[in-house]
Interface confidence: low
Amino acid sequence: GITNINCSGHIWVEPATIFKMGMNISIYCQAAIKNCQPRKLHFYKNGIKERFQITRINKTTARLWYKNFLEPHASMYCTAECPKHFQETLICGKDISSGYPPDIPDEVTCVIYEYSGNMTCTWNAGKLTYIDTKYVVHVKSLETEEEQQYLTSSYINISTDSLQGGKKYLVWVQAANALGMEESKQLQIHLDDIVIPSAAVISRAETINATVPKTIIYWDSQTTIEKVSCEMRYKATTNQTWNVKEFDTNFTYVQQSEFYLEPNIKYVFQVRCQETGKRYWQPWSSLFFHKTPETVPQVTSKAFQHDTWNSGLTVASISTGHLTSDNRGDIG
């Protein structure tokens, strides 16, 4: 940026170099150039000369005034027109920033994804600040009263090995930037209650010919947690509304869930699980598509990942990978 230039004078900003977006600000330039009584002082913003709201204060100083400054960043510098100098002489420059103080962090959430070895804490940071904002995550054991602090710019992964103060903790987040500091409420957690089981994945689907054809969804998880509750949601891709089935699950074997679906319709399925009775769910799994056969079955030709159907005695869809997970709700 502009901070490394050799100055022949001084440039400063009131109320500050970093200020609240939308404020009125004044930028002052004071020349200190040998053998120069400046005829004129000029201001440049991002390389473009400003023409308005410039006031000469005295022989060596001028002020540039901005009303309702809304740019997150700008490089300012000023120059002097010196007698006997053909070109303007650079006086000094400064990078300025505008933004907002942080909002109070809320929705502080800490989870341990099974097998990750980390406790992941996230929060809603609120509105965009536009300026450098840091977060300090405080983790205080309710058993030993020991407190640890972690500095981050977004979320934080804390190794579970470093959580030596028992099972119960208070977690809170401080947000700070040049314009202010805010602190979240305290979240009380128990490490055993925030574990999210290893991701559940739908591996394949098949529709079996019968008096009433039925579709079987095969799904599994590598979790070692014994008591797991899961939800599978499904809908025709043309619908807005999901249907949800609930399961109490033991993942010692691949799960098979039966659905009686309309023929010749493309459906989408997702699954998610939680440790039974606990607070946090997995995000919904990748979208899994399956099209049911027409009512009069024909011979199966082939099966294909995610978005395939074939009429026949058995119609199968096989998952070989993950699409982007949709954990916000409906898809079109």
Partner: antibody, heavy 121, light 112 residues
Framework: EVQLQQSGAELVKPGASVKISCKAS????????MNWVKQSHGKSLEWIGN????????SYNQEFKGKATLTVDKSSSTAYMLLNSLTSEDSAVYYC??????????????WGQGTTLTVSS | DIVLTQTAPSVPVTPGESVSISCRSS???????????LYWFLQRPGQSPQLLIY???NLASGVPDRFSGSGSGTAFTLRISRVEAEDVGVYYC?????????FGSGTRLEIK
């Protein structure tokens, strides 16, 4: 209307245990911490501890660890305090009082009517 | 533990006059978030305590604005202007900056 209805007065013998209840109504029980406070006759108030009904997490004043055990029954929106190995020192009025889920909002905004415990042989 | 000291066991007051009740803390109750975690309660004879003031200066719901709280990090005052007969009872300060929450010994307000 928020109400905390406590169980009636108790007269118990030294060495025995007693379980005091506090039934909450008029708000979502699991959204607020429940505090318990002791007031000995003619004396000030002492905070015993609190319980987070959502998780069942408890925090105790060290003075009451081993003396008081706090539990909840979410289905009936009731908080309980079990006091064991009772002595005459435990004779007091015990209050339940609602507090925010988090330590830095309004605490103790609603109180039960109190349960009088008398320990005597 | 944080100790709260209420030096005056009782204060006599004439109805209609103002009165101040003081409370001192052994540790600053000013949190880094700018809040001061001191509460005031009134316990009328034969009743449960009632919240009057939270976070040093905030008036609890339903409490008359004759009551006000002020203070620094360690010295606090509850002021009652135009005292009424129904204001009699014991006034307690309480900190909930840190566990264990602690109460002052109480100051009894008596009508002359």
């Amino acid at each position: 209307e928020v109400q905390l209805q406590q169980s009636g007065a108790e007269l118990v013998k030294p060495g025995a245990s007693v379980k005091i209840s506090c039934k909450a109504s008029g708000y979502s029980f699991t959204d607020y911490i429940m505090n318990w406070v002791k007031q000995s006759h003619g004396k000030s108030l002492e905070w015993i501890g609190n319980i987070n009904p959502y998780f069942g997490f408890t925090s105790y004043n060290q003075e009451f660890k081993g003396k008081a055990t706090l539990t909840v029954d979410k289905s009936s929106s009731t908080a309980y305090m079990l006091l064991n190995s009772l002595t005459s020192e435990d004779s007091a009025v015990y209050y339940c009082s609602r507090g925010s889920y988090y330590g830095y909002e309004t605490f103790f905004d609603y109180w039960g009517q109190g349960t009088t415990l008398t320990v005597s042989s | 533990d944080i100790v709260l000291t209420q030096t005056a066991p009782s204060v006599p007051v004439t109805p209609g006059e103002s009165v101040s009740i003081s409370c001192r803390s052994s540790k600053s109750l000013l949190h880094s978030n700018g809040n001061t975690y001191l509460y005031w309660f009134l316990q009328r004879p034969g009743q449960s305590p009632q919240l009057l003031i939270y976070r040093m200066s905030n008036l609890a719901s339903g409490v008359p604005d004759r009551f006000s709280g002020s203070g620094s990090g360690t010295a606090f005052t509850l002021r009652i202007s135009r005292v009424e007969a129904e204001d009699v009872g014991v006034y307690y300060c309480m900190q909930h900056l840190e566990y264990p929450y602690t109460f002052g010994s109480g100051t009894r307000l008596e009508i002359k």
